[in-house]
C-alpha cells in the first residue's frame, strides 16, 4: 500500500451567503491526523500518534496552509451560481500518494452537497467530471472561476501537488508512520439472546495496518459468511484500527467455537468465555 496524505476541506453556505468557518480534516496513511474545526483555524493533532509524527513543534505552518486553503474554497463556493436557499456545502478532497517504487500520484476532487462534480489529476492537470448535467454545470462554473486567475491555475495547483508530497515526505521522516506493525488486542464477549441461543462477539482493537482476518469457527471449521456479522474496520483515534465479528450459537456449545484472528502474518485463536465474564486476550505470546 502507498503512503498517503489526504486533505478534506468543507465550507458551507446558508441562503447563498458563504459562512466564515470551515472544517478541514487531514488523514495520514488513512488515519485521522490533523483537524481544524473552529472559526479561527488551529491545527490540532488527532491523538498521541499525530503528535509523535509532528514532533515538538508548533503547528503554525499547518494552520497557515489549512487556513489559506479554506479561504480559497470559500471564494470558490461564492462563485457557484447554483446557490439556492438553505444549507449547501462545497467539499474539496486532495490526495497525494508515494508508492513503494517512489512513483507519486496526486488528485483533487470537488463535491457539492456531497455529490462529486469535478476531479483533477494534479500531475497531468487533466480534469474529469461525471456525465450528469448538474455535475457538468457545476464543473464548468468552478473551472471558469479557477481560470479567471491564471496564476492560480498554473502555479497554485502545481504547488498543491508539490506541497502535499513535500509534507507527506516530512511526516514520513518522523519514522512513526513507516510501515510499522501493531498487533491487535482481541477479546471475546457473550450476551444472552433468545431461546437458548447466545451471541458471541469477537473484537480486535489497536492494530496496524488495517488488513485483518477475523472470523468464527466451529470445531475448527469456518462458519459461513452469512452466519456472521462483521463490523467495519475503523480508525480508533490512536493511529490504529478496530473491528469486530459476531455470531449466534447454542448455549452450552461455547467450548466448540473459537474466534480466529490473523494479522500481518501472525494468528491466534480465542475461545468463548464460559460465563458472562469478559475474557481479555493479550497480545500474541
Amino acid at each position: 500500500e502507498p503512503h498517503s496524505l489526504r486533505y478534506n476541506l468543507t465550507v458551507l453556505s446558508w441562503d447563498g451567503s458563504v459562512q466564515s468557518g470551515f472544517l478541514t480534516e487531514v488523514h495520514l496513511d488513512g488515519q485521522p491526523f490533523l483537524r481544524c474545526d473552529r472559526q479561527k483555524c488551529r491545527a490540532k493533532p488527532q491523538g498521541q500518534w499525530a503528535e509523535d509524527v509532528l514532533g515538538n513543534k508548533t503547528w503554525d505552518r499547518e494552520t497557515r496552509d489549512l487556513t489559506g486553503n479554506g479561504k480559497d474554497l470559500r471564494m470558490t463556493l461564492a462563485h457557484i451560481k447554483d446557490q439556492k436557499e438553505g444549507l449547501h456545502s462545497l467539499q474539496e478532497i486532495r490526495v497525494c500518494e508515494i508508492h513503494e517504487d517512489n512513483s507519486t500520484r496526486s488528485s483533487q476532487h470537488f463535491y457539492y452537497d456531497g455529490e462529486l462534480f469535478l476531479s483533477q489529476n494534479l500531475e497531468t492537470k487533466e480534469w474529469t467530471m461525471p456525465q450528469s448535467s448538474r455535475a457538468q454545470t457545476l464543473a464548468m462554473n468552478v473551472r471558469n472561476f479557477l481560470k479567471e486567475d491564471a496564476m492560480k491555475t498554473k502555479t497554485h495547483y502545481h504547488a498543491m501537488h508539490a506541497d502535499c508530497l513535500q509534507e507527506l515526505r516530512r511526516y514520513l521522516k518522523s519514522g512513526v508512520v513507516l510501515r510499522r506493525t501493531v498487533p491487535p488486542m482481541v477479546n471475546v464477549t457473550r450476551s444472552e439472546a433468545s431461546e437458548g441461543n447466545i451471541t458471541v462477539t469477537c473484537r480486535a482493537s489497536g492494530f496496524y495496518p488495517w488488513n485483518i482476518t477475523l472470523s468464527w469457527r466451529q470445531d475448527g471449521v469456518s462458519l459461513s459468511h452469512d452466519t456472521q456479522q462483521w463490523g467495519d474496520v475503523l480508525p480508533d483515534g490512536n493511529g490504529t484500527y478496530q473491528t469486530w465479528v459476531a455470531t449466534r450459537i447454542c448455549q452450552g456449545e461455547e467450548q466448540r467455537f473459537t474466534c480466529y484472528m490473523e494479522h500481518s502474518g501472525n494468528h491466534s485463536t480465542h475461545p468463548v468465555p464460559s460465563g458472562k465474564v469478559l475474557v481479555l486476550q493479550s497480545h500474541w505470546q
Partner: antibody, heavy 122, light 106 residues
Framework: EVQLVESGGGLVQSGGSLRLSCVAS????????MNWVRQAPGKGLEWISY????????YYADSVKGRFTISRDNAKKSLYLQMNSLRDEDTAVYYC???????????????WGQGTMVTVSS | DIQMTQSPSSLSASVGDRVTITCRAS??????LNWYQQKPGKAPKLLIY???SLQSGVPSRFSGSGSGTDFTLTISSLQPEDFATYYC????????FGGGTKVDIK
Amino acid sequence: EVQLVESGGGLVQSGGSLRLSCVASGFTLSRYSMNWVRQAPGKGLEWISYINSRSNTIYYADSVKGRFTISRDNAKKSLYLQMNSLRDEDTAVYYCARVSDITGNTGAFDIWGQGTMVTVSS
Amino acid sequence: DIQMTQSPSSLSASVGDRVTITCRASQSISSYLNWYQQKPGKAPKLLIYAASSLQSGVPSRFSGSGSGTDFTLTISSLQPEDFATYYCQQSYSTLTFGGGTKVDIK
C-alpha cells in the same frame, strides 16, 4: 458403541440420481458437524461436502457443487447426500465422517462409516 | 482453493525405521492440519489433529509438527501394523486432503 453406517449406494446410469444415507448411533448427531468424503478405486481421499450442527454452514467441493446436496435430519439421526447428474468420475466409495468436538480441534474427522460403493456407468 | 501436496507419494521402509512424511499447503493454513491413516478396504483413522495433537488412543510413536505451509508426520519406530497410506487434511479454508503417502515393506 459410537458408529456411522452408510447406505444407498449401488449402480446408476450416467446422468442419474442417487441418495445416500448415514445413520448415527452411540452419540447425539445434532451436536456434531458432519461430512461426506469419497474415494475412487485406487485413488486418494476426496472431501466433498460439510454441514455443521445447525445446518447453517454448508460447503461443497467444486467437483460436486450444483449437483450434490447435503442435508441432515437430527430427529432421525441421519445425514444425507442427494446426488444428481451423476458422472463416471463420481464412481467411488462414499464415507460419512463426524467432525470431532474436542477443544482445540481443527476440523478433524474422528468417526468414519464403513463406506458405501457408488458405481456410475455410461 | 488450497492445495495440499504430500511427499513422497510412496516409500518403502522396514520395521523399526523412523519414517517422515511431509505435507505442504499452497498457502498458510496456520495449524489447521490433521493426519489420517488408512489401511486397504478400511475407513481412515484420525491420528493427529491441530498439526501436533495426538488423537486419543493413538500410539505415541506418531507425532506431528509444523505450522503455516509445511507440516510433518513422523513415525519414530515403524511397527508392522503401521504399513498403510497416510493422508493430511486442512480445514483452514473449507476442507481438502493431500494426495496420500503409501508406506510399504522394504
